[in-house]
């Protein structure tokens, strides 16, 4: 039942030799190898007008191997394919072609993009970012005290980086100015320079900003009439409203 092609070829060529080279089990002067030693793959190579049989440890580029019970045979992949699973399914295309679902294409179908590293058509991946973190505390020069106008920041992570044709990533951090009621730095928070500066004198700007709120107690003392106090309270309320407005509108984005 298991008629062999090798046997037929041997009948056609009486000059079959048993003393073959390069892994051949049987060979002929005209056709080269007719069969191979165990575990080697038989491949027919076209040289000009004739086909020469060669025995190799694995199939060459552009061929795939089938291990039949009586012969390991190499079969040619499709013309544009470098490595294939079988006739229908390519797994690596020749240079200049892109692999898509087992086929070699000269350009990728719509909705897909070429990955020039793997030489495959892949789905376009868009950037994905996480939700924003909460805003950081209002800070200035790394401190949360000793100032009135500072900045606060929020960040987000990139969950999925985009592919070449995907949507670009949005900014990953956002900074805005913030205004807080001045708070004196406690001893631990105050640096040497800060202490010396305070000891010398309060500058004009600070004197202007100082109010009778509990945060600025002891910085300035004066006797006020009830009318003056009422005026002062009105001014503070206006200031507070302006500060809230500013916090809403001022926003700086940075991309990393």
């Amino acid at each position: 039942q298991n008629a062999s092609r090798g046997r037929r070829q041997r009948r056609m060529h009486p000059n079959v030799s048993q003393g073959c080279q390069g892994g051949c089990a049987t060979c002929s002067d005209y056709n080269g190898c007719l069969s191979c030693k165990p575990r080697l793959f038989f491949v027919l190579e076209r040289i000009g007008m004739k086909q020469i049989g060669v025995c190799l440890s694995s199939c060459p580029s552009g061929y795939y191997g089938t291990r039949y019970p009586d012969i390991n045979k190499c079969t040619k992949c499709k013309v544009d394919c470098d490595t294939c699973f079988n006739k229908n399914f390519c797994t690596k295309c020749k240079s200049g072609f892109y692999l898509h679902l087992g086929k070699c294409l000269d350009s990728c179908p719509e909705g897909l993009e070429a990955n020039n590293h793997t030489m495959e058509c892949v789905s376009i991946v868009h950037c994905e970012a996480s939700e924003w973190s909460p805003w950081s505390p209002c800070m200035k020069k790394g401190k949360t005290c000793g100032f009135k106008r500072g900045t606060e920041t929020r960040v987000r992570d990139i969950l999925q980086h985009p592919s070449a044709k995907g949507n670009l990533c949005p900014p990953t951090s956002e900074t805005r100015t913030c205004i807080v009621q001045r708070k004196k730095c406690s001893k631990g928070e105050r640096g040497k320079k800060g202490r010396e500066r305070k000891r010398k004198k309060l500058n004009k700007e600070e004197r202007k900003e100082t109010s009778s709120s509990s945060d600025s107690k002891g910085l300035e003392s004066s006797i006020e009439t009830p009318d003056q106090q009422e005026n002062k309270e009105r001014q503070q309320q206006q200031k507070r409203r302006a500060r809230d407005k500013q916090q809403k509108s001022v926003s700086v984005s940075t991309v990393h």
Epitope: Q1, N2, A3, S4, R5, R8, Y64, T66, R67, Y68, P69, D70, F85, N86, K87, N88, F89, T91
Partner: antibody
């Protein structure tokens, strides 16, 4: 569109013969090794036999060797499985398939029942 | 012959659930493994070849992995149309051998 259409199934008594055929279209039949794969009722898949693309070599599973004969006609794109000395354990749906390491194309299957 | 051991024999999954089917080869078969899907009353259809490559038309929720002797088929998000029998087959050498199959049902 690739099509493999089986015919010739039916019921036979143990020890009798049956021939199932497969007509192929939609692909280059002469490029492919062709096979029969069977599936007993409520069971798994079992490879039966393969004939290589040019018809020069055939391979059979041990349990059918000497009883089944596989042949092909590349000019007509047909595959035939001659089943002799049938046994009850040969009862199955027989699928014709293009065999190139994997079974890439399958027929719809034909039922063969061996029962007394 | 190379023996293919498939597990589990059957399982049921809820819609959207991730499902895995294992296939073990009795010897090293490199990545020469194929998966088939067979829906009730139909012929098998090739799903994955070369252990991890999807056949044209197969949804991307299906994926295959493995090399050597251990392989698996994963369905990320079970759908009603995935209810079927699944078979692995080694394509490393003749004679071709199949796993016993896994019946996947919908809960």
């Amino acid at each position: 569109e690739v099509q493999l259409v089986e015919s010739g199934g039916g019921s036979v008594q143990p020890g009798r013969s049956l021939k199932v055929s497969c007509a192929a279209s939609g692909f280059t039949f002469s490029d492919y090794d062709m096979a029969w794969v069977r599936q007993a009722p409520k069971k798994g898949l079992e490879w039966v036999a393969t004939i290589i693309y040019d018809g020069s070599r055939t391979y059979y599973r041990d349990s059918v060797k000497g009883r089944f004969t596989l042949s092909r006609d590349n000019t007509k794109s047909t595959l035939c499985l001659q089943m002799d000395s049938l046994r009850s354990e040969d009862t199955a749906t027989y699928y014709c398939a293009a065999h190139d390491r994997s079974f890439d194309y399958w027929g719809q299957g034909i039922m063969v029942t061996v029962s007394s | 012959d190379i023996q293919m051991t498939q597990s589990p024999a059957s399982l049921s999954a809820s819609l959207g659930e991730t499902v895995s089917i294992e296939c073990l080869a009795s010897e090293d078969i490199s990545n020469d493994l194929v998966w088939y899907q067979q829906k009730s009353g139909k012929s098998p259809q090739l799903l994955i070849y070369a252990a991890s490559r999807l056949q044209d038309g197969v949804p991307s929720r299906f994926s295959g992995s493995g090399f050597g002797t251990r392989f698996s088929l994963k369905i990320s998000g079970m759908q009603p149309e995935d209810e079927a029998d699944y078979f692995c087959q080694q394509s490393y050498k003749y004679l071709p051998t199949f796993g016993a199959g896994t019946k996947l049902g919908l809960k």
